[in-house]
Amino acid sequence: SFQRVRIMGGTNRGRAEVYYNNEWGTICDDDWDNNDATVFCRMLGYSRGRALSSYGGGSGNIWLDNVNCRGTENSLWDCSKNSWGNHNCVHNEDAGVECS
């Protein structure tokens, strides 16, 4: 399936969202770090990323939690993470990114 991510709220800085099961959703910031953000940003053509926590403002699905990338992956889909939609989070805990 086509792997898509987007930044909401700005061009290179904002809430991190992923597309799954034909719907956009957010990522919980549990364990969200710069390695995860770098992989996310790499999917958008940037070379590096910085993790933002409690970015907030999201709605709908929280698709990912406990994302754990090494930082070398080309896609979040290749990283260790909970199964899609399996989380213990609320939207106050939405992850963000700043890409460069």
Partner: antibody
Framework: EVQLVESGGGLVQPGSSLKLSCVAS????????MNWIRQAPKKGLEWIAL????????YYADSVKGRFTISRDNSKNTLYLEMNSLRSEDTAMYYC?????????????WGQGVMVTVSS | DVQMTQSPSYLAASPGESVSISCKAS??????LAWYQEKPEKTNKLLIY???TLQSGTPSRFSGSGSGTDFTLTIRNLEPEDFAVYYC?????????FGSGTKLEIK
Amino acid sequence: EVQLVESGGGLVQPGSSLKLSCVASKFTFSNYGMNWIRQAPKKGLEWIALIYYNSNNKYYADSVKGRFTISRDNSKNTLYLEMNSLRSEDTAMYYCAKSLTGGSDYFDSWGQGVMVTVSS
Amino acid sequence: DVQMTQSPSYLAASPGESVSISCKASKSIGTFLAWYQEKPEKTNKLLIYSGSTLQSGTPSRFSGSGSGTDFTLTIRNLEPEDFAVYYCQQHDEYPFTFGSGTKLEIK
């Protein structure tokens, strides 16, 4: 407008302890990362500690690691810095600063600072 | 640690002029850089973050540019309230580090 008010500073002897407080108001304290930054007399700014909005992550500069502890009480809108084994080089103005978001981020609001003097 | 080298340390200018302050990082920090303003009896103010994004409330006469290791803060058409001390700060890696500051004085 965001308000951050530090307290707890003073003159202490080397080797002693001190606990700084920073009371926050006019924003939802529990949603934001918080930092301590210091400035020694005639020296530059030095970031020393960060705590995430939920206290799950804490980071320290090497110069204070193992001696200083950052903590927060979201129910009291208060940030703390417990300082042990104080040294003369810890003499500085200590500022608390709010992060733009819930964790590691730029410092978008600062307090006026509180002075800590370590001297015998 | 990432060393931030700011220049000049002192800068004298007149209202209405334009000035630029340089900040160089000892390694590439992408665009993860902020600029702050320090004034007596006031709390420090975030002016610019992410290298070039103006913080809410920052006048448009301020601008930031650069990426990697070289960054610049430019203030155009200086106003009397702009005379202050300016610091750059990297937010790429721990520990977050600041430049030594630039004091902008009235000529």
